[in-house]
Interface confidence: low
Amino acid sequence: AVDLTLLANLRLTDPQRFFLTCVSGEAGAGRGSDAWGPPLLLEKDDRIVRTPPGPPLRLARNGSHQVTLRGFSKPSDLVGVFSCVGGAGARRTRVIYVHNSPGAHLLPDKVTHTVNKGDTAVLSARVHKEKQTDVIWKSNGSYFYTLDWHEAQDGRFLLQLPNVQPPSSGIYSATYLEASPLGSAFFRLIVRGCGAGRWGPGCTKECPGCLHGGVCHDHDGECVCPPGFTGTRCEQACREGRFGQSCQEQCPGISGCRGLTFCLPDPYGCSCGSGWRGSQCQEACAPGHFGADCRLQCQCQNGGTCDRFSGCVCPSGWHGVHCEKSDRIPQILNMASELEFNLETMPRINCAAAGNPFPVRGSIELRKPDGTVLLSTKAIVEPEKTTAEFEVPRLVLADSGFWECRVSTSGGQDSRRFKVNVKVPPVPLAAPRLLTKQSRQLVVSPLVSFSGDGPISTVRLHYRPQDSTMDWSTIVVDPSENVTLMNLRPKTGYSVRVQLSRPGEGGEGAWGPPTLMTTDCPEPLLQPWLEGWHVEGTDRLRVSWSLPLVPGPLVGDGFLLRLWDGTRGQERRENVSSPQARTALLTGLTPGTHYQLDVQLYHCTLLGPASPPAHVLLPPSGPPAPRHLHAQALSDSEIQLTWKHPEALPGPISKYVVEVQVAGGAGDPLWIDVDRPEETSTIIRGLNASTRYLFRMRASIQGLGDWSNTVEESTLGNGLQAEGPVQESRAAEEGLDQ
């Protein structure tokens, strides 16, 4: 059964202190066989018992193993059905807790009733606050039966359910007519799918004989042990305050498990923890009683004393549930309660026994679930014990189940049942996944979904070149880590397969499906050389480089130029996607910045060696644009430009640059320097007649500044075509009329 416990804290004086906690002891709770599985769910189930809406309950998770529900504000919030769901896949299990109001008119004598198929179930509702009206019984929220109020026996209303069947399972309630449903007595009836002591399809298999109040699961024959007991047959008591299938959990708080109700997977239901009883699980067991709800009686013999948590504590020389077995009766020693083997293995199982007379080889036998008896092949006889070794024939899945080691001597006999789990070695359902590749290595994620059983102990990756008949190379890796296949050939396809293993002999599964993974191209080896660079503006840089001449084709797809701005700690990368390129224009750079520059050849995702770096200082940015640029035609070949100096100059202007371009023309523009920076006017001569021109200008201090607005003007008349524009400057004060 799934190791899932729902704990209810029954300190009911203050609903705000009430909480429900669901604890999973499953290995990797919330984890499926190959990936994160569904989490624990804990919720109030309002389908049958509806309560007035209140503030939402608070859910707090403690890892994937525990979830707690708090935030109850009033007693009515507590009444009803709560459920916890845990486990993955086919093992997904729901645990149910039914909460009754302590102030209800009717209270259940016992909330959880677990009965066998065909039994008679009797639900008993005790009168707590009498009302002289009929009592309505409901099953799963639907009307079921009515009792007249005179029919109470000893202050109890009884509902008898003869010959119950599994569909009769569910939530039952007893309510006074016209009373609030919150004052009902709520019960939970669990009907096992088989008669007493039987389990399995057709109920043909015999239960192991669960001890200490454990209940045999009708599907798998396992004992669902009460809180505080463990072992295949619940034969072992946990120490006080412990619960869970391996006693691995501990009750919270200083008073141990006092005041806690424990709910376990069906068909167990709910009870107090070991050593406690009462409707609120706050009363210790009476002398001579022990276990969950104090339902068990000690009846210790031979001087044994009764411990309310674990039962009889035997004096030296005695053992057994009631201290009824003398240490001289043969005793099987330290037999594991559960063993795990892999399918088709032939394990050796050891069974050690002591006693007087001393057990010999022939007195110890091993019985399989199908009744086959195995005799030991050898025995190791020591002064204090005999260990018989059994060679088990090749295991099949049907060998899963309860095996039994039995020792018989004239002093008596002892037997110990233990569970054998036959596990199927895991087989990958998918191929491994390629994460990254280089020219000589592949990084692979090996763990994929698989059939068969976990946990995965080792992952073997088999690989070889595609279409090769050479032996497979194998690498053993940790299941949780990605693996790097090294020393591969560049640009080569490899067939890669995964083989999974689980713990134990014969745990290796079959190989999974192959996948093709191809290594990257070879890394480039040539180191470029920076031939030169040229500043084309405050934010533009032209770079040129060369490569050494080598025989054969060039191994490369292009070049990566890197500019490092050490002041700002920024790197600029420029990709030149042609391997034939030997020059590049870098734009959008920061004026006045000192850059370190290098270039590398790249091939696929691999970078070759970087060139020796160059250090480049870009000039600072220039001044603002000249203002109010104006163009005025003077003749068929002359146009006068006038402007105002830029504002907020960072320094003295060294010159102005005028750009002249024929409007709509396809040719390059012409740049003309005005070398007398104090002037605010110039005449551009040598223009063509009746031609529209575009002009703009900028100032220069250390670097060229921003362009002004563009102005347009046409030359006059139909004069002769000029040689080309030239310039003559004068100060604006001279004016055109002089």
């Epitope: 463990t230 072992q236 946990c238 120490r239 412990r242 391996s246 006693c247 411990d307 674990s310 504590v313 035997c314 004096p315 030296s316 020389g317 005695w318 053992h319 240490d327 005793q331 020693l333 330290n334 594991a336 063993l339 394990p347 050891n350 050690a352 002591a354 190791i380 020591e382 204090e384 014990k385 260990t387 713990p503 134990g504 002999e505």
Partner: antibody
Framework: EVQLLESGGGLVQPGGSLRLSCAAS????????MQWVRQAPGKGLEWVSS????????YYADSVKGRFTISRDNSKNTLYLQMNSLRAEDTAVYYC??????????????WGQGTMVTVSS | QSVLTQPPSVSGIPGQRVTISCSGN????????VTWYQQLPGTAPKLLIY???RRPSGVPDRFSGSRSDTSASLAISGLQSEDEAEYHC??????????FGGGTKLTVL
């Protein structure tokens, strides 16, 4: 508080005898499998002996078999190790230990502080 | 000569992940689980990992155990200076005898 307290160690000549005791408190001693484990100076741990709760079964390492005897008195909550024919290689800190929490067989979660046994002429 | 084999020493820097191996044979590792102990200088051993990979309450989740066939390993991630100690692996053999490794000294550099 759960506690194991060893005593009885000391200096003894080769061939001599010594009896170690281990007093248990804070748990139901009579229900637990008990162990002696030793550690020679600068060396690893070595399992010496174990005894079942009733005292009905005892186990010994090959290196001490026939020379050492483990026993217990459940009424006194005490574990003993009678060591005879002592040798120089028996020099070690001797710990008593138990697996109180029902973990796996080799998982001893309660240990004493140890008692030193020196075998030297 | 210890029955289980461990490296005499390992070392690591704070924050690093280190692993300690422990190998045995079919008699002791075959159907029995592995336990790991931490022993600080001058003190008794402390249970660290049981049943191959389970941690008792109070042991940080930086410590993890795994095993396959006849070898086991203890991994310590996010190494801290207080992890400097001797680490011992242990198991039970098929004759119901306890077996230990020789111990591994972990040094935090």
């Amino acid at each position: 508080e759960v506690q194991l307290l060893e005593s009885g160690g000391g200096l003894v000549q080769p061939g001599g005898s010594l009896r170690l005791s281990c007093a248990a408190s804070g748990f139901t001693f009579s229900q637990y499998l008990m162990q002696w484990v030793r550690q020679a100076p600068g060396k690893g741990l070595e399992w010496v002996s174990s005894i079942y709760p009733s005292g009905g079964a005892t186990y010994y390492a090959d290196s001490v078999k026939g020379r050492f005897t483990i026993s217990r008195d459940n009424s006194k909550n005490t574990l003993y190790l009678q060591m005879n024919s002592l040798r120089a290689e028996d020099t070690a800190v001797y710990y008593c230990a138990t697996r109180k929490d029902g973990y796996s067989r080799s998982a001893f979660d309660i240990w004493g502080q140890g008692t030193m046994v020196t075998v030297s002429s | 000569q210890s029955v289980l084999t461990q490296p005499p020493s390992v070392s690591g820097i704070p924050g690093q992940r280190v692993t300690i191996s422990c190998s045995g044979n079919n008699s002791n590792f075959g159907s029995n689980t592995v336990t790991w102990y931490q022993q600080l200088p001058g003190t008794a051993p402390k249970l660290l990992i049981y049943s191959d990979s389970r941690r008792p309450s109070g042991v940080p989740d930086r410590f993890s155990g795994s095993r396959s066939d006849t070898s086991a390993s203890l991994a310590i991630s996010g190494l801290q200076s207080e992890d400097e100690a001797e680490y011992h692996c242990a198991a039970w053999d098929d004759s119901l005898n306890g077996v230990f490794g020789g111990g591994t000294k972990l040094t935090v550099l």
